[in-house]
Interface confidence: medium
């Protein structure tokens, strides 16, 4: 709230508490206050105050417990390096300024690990890994020196232990003591040194979050053998016996927020959406917790490791729940994931042991009741014998996250909850609830499933490329006869589907145009495939003039696509890439996508276009139950098509058929159409089962959408369940298994 | 083996700009930072500020700061130092210099240096 | 800004003697975590760019004669030439690198008597 709108309700003036070079917002209905300073600023010497009961704000203490008469917003600076061992870093500085750069060098016979160019960043930190040089003499390898941290201990032997520290005035995020274990790793995690202006980006927490939940989900065989000194991934088999349980802790204390909570649910949305993507079906507890915690879901029940279900009741939780008593006792929230971890008679079922338990704690601060909660961790590592005994520690089978949103998040405090794994980052602080929004976001959109077909970034700072990050453009140019334009869809790193009525024979590859993802450059084309039934003059002599069975054609492109969030493949139809998206059983067949993506009935789909220079999607149905027939014989209606005596004649049974006024009214193709994608979009995910064809009227004469069309104005789609051995034939090599 | 050849001689008058070039050889440009030194007639070096050619980023000195830009092409592997709103104190001789590795501070390869002559 | 001090300004020694240059700095140079000093010293002939000849304060630069010596740790160092000979007639600067800025002495001219 700006403060000039909002009085505290305490008995704090506002006088005087002002900020040079920035703004402040109060917090907990006046109770606090937080200071703003533009990027690249941060606000001296203290972010937050709070309102004393004397009626006085905190008073402003510096590090050294200097007091402060004004606050400030003062540039921000990255921490130099306190120590570099075995080589050198330049330049060397007292303080270092955004977008300064330092290198790393190591001296002879030592090896550099991590980056050896570093940049600071508006954040404060520096970007890239912790730069080490080792010469692999120790039983580990040296565990480095992390910007900001000292370091005590420089005997790398089995058992031995370095600790950290950081200067006064910041917080120890990670691991204060490391030991050197068998098997070449280090206990615990890198720590860094954290001041409290300091947040993640979304960006850092998405990469490091993906990152080690992937470690969890996607694993691959534990035994897999590794010497001394090497750097070992945590690796887990995902036993086929063995199953996985995601705890959702989700903080609905006063000091949330109704639309913060709101928030929190879309990122776990989100999450169970990005999980289920991955093919593996955990079971899912929900809980959310203010003074008491409460139980939506737990996984026990039949249905929590149904995706959608799970989904359904998590949007369905109210803000409003908590009201009433809205403290934060964190410690209650964890005792009700104890609850639903521990067995009943205390009598262990069988493959207990097998099982992993991921918790997500997601909380905008201070747990103010009920005790410390870490002594619940504990009990939760006891019940699933963590760390007992040293040959099998299982640290593998828990793994707990923990999100701090805002200002008022206690370091100390989310740092002693979340687990701490090599290489792994499990603690995160995010200035707001926007940019835990976009962790998630950009989360479901990591580099990992860039490959994942059908997945967009539907976010509110998306353009019209990360909302459809498959479309293609495509124009011809033809000396002294124009351009035609079309729309194409990506399907893989080297091809691009579209009509193959948008080339002649005569269209020469340097003269066409492709351009993906918005951007200005065309990509340099190889070849342009036809189906080889495709004849638009096929059938001239019976009177039809021209004639469109067939009508896909695939661009192969020269240089391989690099995915991003703006390039991305749709699904096709019969690939195991569509199984995943539509979350069905690995051993569906072809049959059964059939019937999951174009039943016998009206189905809703739709296609892209491009309007004033903007992509909008179109919402169609495609006719494919009662209405197929009349919807097939308004083909006659066509120019050329008039006196075709039986309309089968031109529309084969490879065409699907939208347009028309019922169940509603469909808006219709436009001749730059041509080539796209005829789109149904399920379970958040996007599959192309058509490709734009013709159309019975021409709406866009004018370059202008007519708004009333007639009833009979259908467009045709080639149907790509009709084309799909041409297709497996042609994209044998591009990895997307066909069934 | 190394080599930084710079342009030739300059003179300019007070308020315009110069801009010397350093082109490097006998090695790989991109992997070794560019510093540039100046020195006043009968004076001492003064250390100007370096640029990265691999990333572009530069680090300039406070006292030269909004008044040099460098810039490099790593096409031609060339080094470009620009000073603006040129004083009369600003007549020396300008020299690009190499370190060991990346950004190292020991100046091991020198240009041959540019003057610069400041005069209405 | 680290200001470096070099003394003698000008020094005048016979062919085949020792010549001594000091260089004081404003600040230590002297890493303590790598007992590393950031100094350098560099030869400068009339007409030439400088010459690098010694760095970490006592490191000699390859190809560079052994009278060629630097000692001193911290705050204090010192370039000596152990036996002067015609070619070594130049000005002498040292140079922090422990931050930025890099900076250097004013420069000690040495002559021959």
């Known amino acids: 709230t700006p403060w000039s709108l909002a009085r505290p309700q305490g008995s704090c003036s506002l006088e005087g508490v002002e900020i040079k070079g920035g703004s402040f917002r109060l917090l907990q209905e006046g109770q606090a206050l937080e200071y703003v300073c533009p990027s690249g600023f941060y606000p001296y010497p203290v972010q937050t105050r709070t309102c004393r009961s004397t009626g006085s704000w905190s008073t402003l203490k510096t590090q050294d417990q200097k007091t402060v008469r004004k606050a400030e917003c003062r540039a921000i600076h990255c921490p130099r390096p306190h120590d570099f061992e075995n080589g050198e870093y330049w330049p060397r500085s007292p303080y270092y300024n955004v977008s300064d750069e330092i290198s790393f060098h190591c001296y002879d016979g030592y090896t550099l690990r991590g980056s050896a160019n570093r940049t600071c960043q508006v954040n404060g930190r520096w970007s890239g890994q912790t730069a080490i040089c080792d010469n692999g003499a120790g039983y580990c390898s040296n565990p480095g020196i992390p910007i900001g941290t000292r370091k005590v201990g420089s005997q790398y032997r089995l058992e031995d232990s370095v600790t950290y520290h950081c200067s006064r005035g910041l917080t120890l995020r990670g691991s204060q003591r490391r030991t050197c274990q068998e098997g070449g790793s280090w206990s615990g995690t890198e720590p860094s040194c954290q001041d409290s202006f300091m947040y993640d980006t979304p960006q850092e927490v998405a990469e490091a979050f993906l990152s080690s939940l992937t470690e969890t989900i996607e694993g691959v065989d534990a035994e897999d053998g590794h010497g001394p000194g090497e750097q070992q991934k945590r690796k887990i088999v995902l036993d086929p016996s063995g199953s996985m349980n995601i705890y959702l802790v989700l903080d609905g204390s006063d000091s949330i927020g109704a639309s913060n909570f709101t928030g929190a649910k879309k990122c776990l949305v989100n999450l169970i959406e990005k999980v289920a993507s991955y093919g593996v079906k955990p079971r899912y507890g929900l809980v959310t917790y203010a003074t008491y915690p409460k139980i939506w879901v737990k996984v026990s029940e039949a249905d929590s490791s149904n995706a959608d279900w799970v989904t359904k009741q998590l949007n369905e939780i109210n803000y409003e729940d908590h009201k009433l008593k809205s403290g934060t006792n964190t410690k209650k929230a964890l005792q009700a994931v104890y609850s639903m971890m521990s067995w009943p008679d205390d009598v262990p079922p069988e493959g207990w042991n097998r099982t992993r338990h991921v918790i997500i704690l997601m909380t905008d601060g201070l747990h103010n009741m009920g005790g410390d909660p870490i002594t619940v961790i504990d009990e939760i590592r006891d019940l699933l014998y963590i760390g007992k005994d040293r040959k099998n520690p299982r640290e593998d089978y828990l793994d707990v996250y923990v999100f701090g949103v805002g200002p008022l998040v206690n370091q100390v405090n989310i740092n002693a909850l979340a687990s701490k794994k090599d290489n792994e980052q499990h603690v995160f602080k995010v200035k707001d609830m926007e940019n835990l929004e976009d962790v998630f976001y950009q989360m479901i959109d990591e580099s990992q499933s860039l490959s994942l077909c059908g997945m967009v970034w539907e976010h509110r700072k998306g353009t019209d490329y990360h909302k459809q990050p498959w479309q293609a453009k495509i124009s011809v140019i033809r000396p002294s006869k124009g351009h035609e334009s079309c729309m194409g869809a990506v399907v893989s790193e080297y091809f691009v589907l579209t009509a193959a009525h948008c080339f002649t024979v005569d269209d020469k590859e340097h003269s066409i145009k492709v351009s993906v993802g918005g951007e200005k450059r065309d990509l340099e084309i190889e070849v342009v495939l036809f189906h080889p039934n495709y004849n638009i003059n096929g059938k001239k002599e019976a009177g039809i003039p021209e004639f469109y069975d067939y009508d896909v054609a695939l661009i192969k492109l020269k240089n391989k696509l690099k995915y991003g969030q703006t390039i991305r493949p749709i699904c096709l139809p019969c690939t195991e890439g569509t199984t995943r998206a539509l979350r069905l059983p690995p051993t569906t067949t072809c049959q059964q996508q059939k019937e999951e993506l174009l039943p016998a009935q009206d189905i809703k789909a739709l296609f892209v276009s491009e309007e004033e220079k903007k992509l909008t999607r179109k919402e169609v149905y495609i006719k494919n139950g009662d209405k197929k027939g009349s919807c097939e014989r308004d083909a006659q209606y066509a120019p050329g098509y008039d006196k075709v005596k039986d309309i089968s004649e031109v529309v084969t049974p490879r065409f699907l058929c939208t347009g028309g006024v019922s169940p509603y009214a469909d808006p219709n193709t436009c001749r730059g159409d041509s080539g796209g994608p005829l789109i149904v979009h399920k379970r958040s995910r996007f599959i192309q089962v058509g490709v734009i064809s013709w159309g019975v009227v021409d709406v866009c004469k004018n370059q202008k959408r007519q708004k009333q069309v007639p009833a009979h104005a259908r467009d045709f789609h080639i149907n790509l369940f009709q084309v799909l051995p041409w297709l497996k034939e042609k994209l044998q090599d591009e990895d997307l298994g066909f069934l | 083996q190394v080599q930084l050849v710079q342009s030739g001689a300059e003179v300019k008058k007070p308020g315009a700009s110069v801009k010397v070039s350093c082109k490097a050889s006998g090695y790989s440009f991109t992997d070794y930072y560019m510093t540039w030194v100046r020195q006043a007639p009968g004076q001492g070096l003064e250390w100007m500020g370096w640029i990265n050619p691999n990333s572009g980023g530069t680090k300039y000195a406070q006292k030269f700061q909004g008044r040099v830009t460098m810039t490099r092409d790593t096409s031609i592997s060339t080094a470009y130092m620009e000073l603006s709103r040129l004083r009369s104190d600003d007549t020396a001789v300008y020299y690009c210099a190499r370190g060991y590795y990346a950004n190292s501070a020991w100046f091991a390869y020198w240009g041959q240096g540019t003057l610069v002559t400041v005069s209405s | 800004d680290i200001v470096m001090t070099q003394s003698p300004d000008s020094l005048a020694v016979s062919l085949g003697e020792r010549a001594t240059i000091n260089c004081k700095s404003s600040?230590?140079?002297?890493?303590?975590?790598?007992?590393?000093?950031?100094l350098a010293w560099y030869q400068q002939k009339p007409g030439q760019p400088p010459k690098l000849l010694i760095y970490w304060a006592s490191t000699r630069e390859s190809g560079v004669p052994d009278r060629f010596s630097g000692s001193g740790s911290g705050t204090d160092f010192t370039l000596t030439i152990s036996s002067l000979q015609a070619e070594d007639v130049a000005v002498y600067y040292c140079k922090q690198v422990y931050n930025l800025p890099w900076t250097f002495g004013q420069g000690t001219k040495l002559e021959i008597k």
């Open positions: 600040q230590s140079l002297l890493q303590s975590s790598t007992s590393k000093n950031y």
